[in-house]
């Protein structure tokens, strides 16, 4: 298949059509639950998602939703108390109308004449907005995750089925399959579909084999495929890297622990804006790259790549993606240079002709037996203590 084209402006919601047509799956999702198969029921109305009305929520609708989401049948259908007190009871006879426009706008209901999603209809403004919300817990609590890839948007593909996390076999695994995974997880689109051994092998069962998604499915379990067979081993666990995953490198320095900061995000390498590049950000990056701590933030060069990423860290995060970050999709960093960093594990610190040495005194552990003290910006001597 052709690989899915990355959108200009990322939209991490599923790529369903804007309006539900008969024959399509229900425009429903479950939120604030323990998995994608439990939670508050929301229905899509044109471009927005709205909580479904609890007053008209029944077992048929619950069953239909669970089936439509590939979550088996419904285990429990309930109503969630509204975030604000419910509206007063009907007004006494003779009172003037209290029906405010906001109230009349109302909440949508999912009304089903049977337990099959094709027999359901989304009815707008069916309930008063302040009423209870529909909730459901489905029997088959299915979920999906990416593990051991350094973030929630890259790694080995694992599905939760029958209470157990398991892998997906890499036979026929391609970008369309990975695209469904990425979109389902809110991780954008697939940058890479990886065969086994790119990530650590799994340990549990292998839930799926011969997965063959079109790329349009909302959930991985909607894709054609076979149950995991015995001839698939964990050395064949499928993996994915999604556009929202961030990975970093330092370029143009003496080694991998020094240079210009570059982040791979949404399919391309980007430089990082130095207007918000401070010691805390440099520290997090050096540590996450296994390069020790940050020794210096040298003056940056003009952006050689698209420079659109900003980070703001407190210094305790494990990776830059755990920091507060923003990616400006339309403008390059205004009046800024590309961030650079020198980490303590860089071999340029061993070199006596290092062009720049930090002005402040920093103590850096290079090896357990040697400590280097850098005293003076002018003096390029290293004193071994």
């Amino acid at each position: 298949h052709p690989s899915p084209a990355p959108p200009d402006q990322l939209n991490t919601s599923s790529a369903e059509s804007e309006l539900w047509e008969p024959g399509e799956r229900l425009p429903v999702r479950l939120t604030n639950g323990s998995s994608s198969c439990s939670g508050t029921v929301e229905v899509r109305l044109e471009a927005s998602w709205e909580p479904a009305c609890g007053a008209l929520w029944d077992s048929r609708a619950a069953e239909a939703v669970c089936r439509a989401l590939g979550c088996g049948g419904a285990e429990a259908a309930s109503q969630l108390a509204p975030p604000t007190p419910e509206l007063p009871p009907p007004p006494a006879a003779g009172n003037t109308s209290v029906a405010a426009n906001a109230t009349l706008a109302g909440a949508p209901a999912l009304l089903c004449s049977g337990a099959e999603w094709r027999l359901c209809e989304v009815v707008e403004h069916a309930c008063r907005s302040d009423g209870r919300r529909a909730r459901v817990t489905c029997a088959e609590n299915r979920a999906l995750r990416l593990v051991d890839g350094g973030g929630a948007c890259a790694g080995r593909v694992e599905m939760l089925e029958h209470g157990e996390w398991g892998s997906v076999c890499d036979d026929t695994w391609d970008l369309e399959d990975a695209h469904v995974v990425c979109r389902q997880l809110g991780c954008g689109w697939a940058v890479q579909a990886l065969p086994g051994l790119h990530f650590t092998p799994g340990r549990g069962p292998i839930h799926r084999d011969q997965v063959n998604c079109s790329g349009a499915e909302a959930y991985l379990w909607d894709c054609p495929g076979l149950p995991g067979q015995h001839y698939c081993g964990h050395k064949e666990d499928a993996g994915a890297v999604c556009s929202e995953h961030q990975s970093w490198r330092l370029t143009g320095g003496a080694d991998r622990c020094e240079g210009q900061v570059e982040v791979h995000f949404r399919g391309v390498w980007n430089t990082v804006c130095d207007s918000e590049w401070y010691p805390s950000e440099a520290k997090v990056l050096c540590q996450s790259l296994g390069c020790g701590t940050a020794v210096e933030r040298p003056k940056g060069l003009p952006h050689s790549l698209s420079g659109r990423m900003y980070y703001s860290c407190n210094g305790e995060e494990l990776t830059l993606s755990n920091c507060s970050w923003r990616f400006n999709n339309s403008n390059l960093c205004s009046q800024s240079l590309a961030a650079r960093v020198l980490c303590s594990a860089s071999r340029s610190l061993h070199n006596l002709s290092t062009p720049e040495v930090p002005a402040s005194v920093q103590t850096v552990t290079i090896e357990s037996s040697v400590t280097v003290k850098i005293e003076n910006k002018e003096s390029r001597e290293l004193m071994l203590l």
């Epitope: 006879a93 003779g94 109308s97 009349l104 009815v123 707008e124």
Partner: nanobody
Amino acid sequence: QVQLVESGGGLVQPGGSLRLSCSASERTFSDYAMGWFRQAPGKEREFVAAINWVGGSTYYADSVKGRFTISRDNSKNTLYLQMNSLRAEDTAVYYCVASWGAMPVLTHVINYWGKGTLVTVSS
């Protein structure tokens, strides 16, 4: 207390049409979502059609979809059910219902019931 009074029932031949009306005593008629239920002899009461407060949303039972049309006139405090292509199985007592919190699709949300009007479809 909202008083609901149905009218317009009667005997009609298969394939014929009838228009039921439901007049509400309440000046706050527009605060209520309205609907119709029916009960055939020896059967349980079943949902027919519902309409929200302002009339912008409607919902029908599968058995009447495309044949029946529910509407309301808030200025006249009146609910209507236009029934076309009537069949023998549409024979029942038709009840007008009013609901404060939600469209009256399920019986537990209904606040008020009318006394009913009989529709008989027979040749």
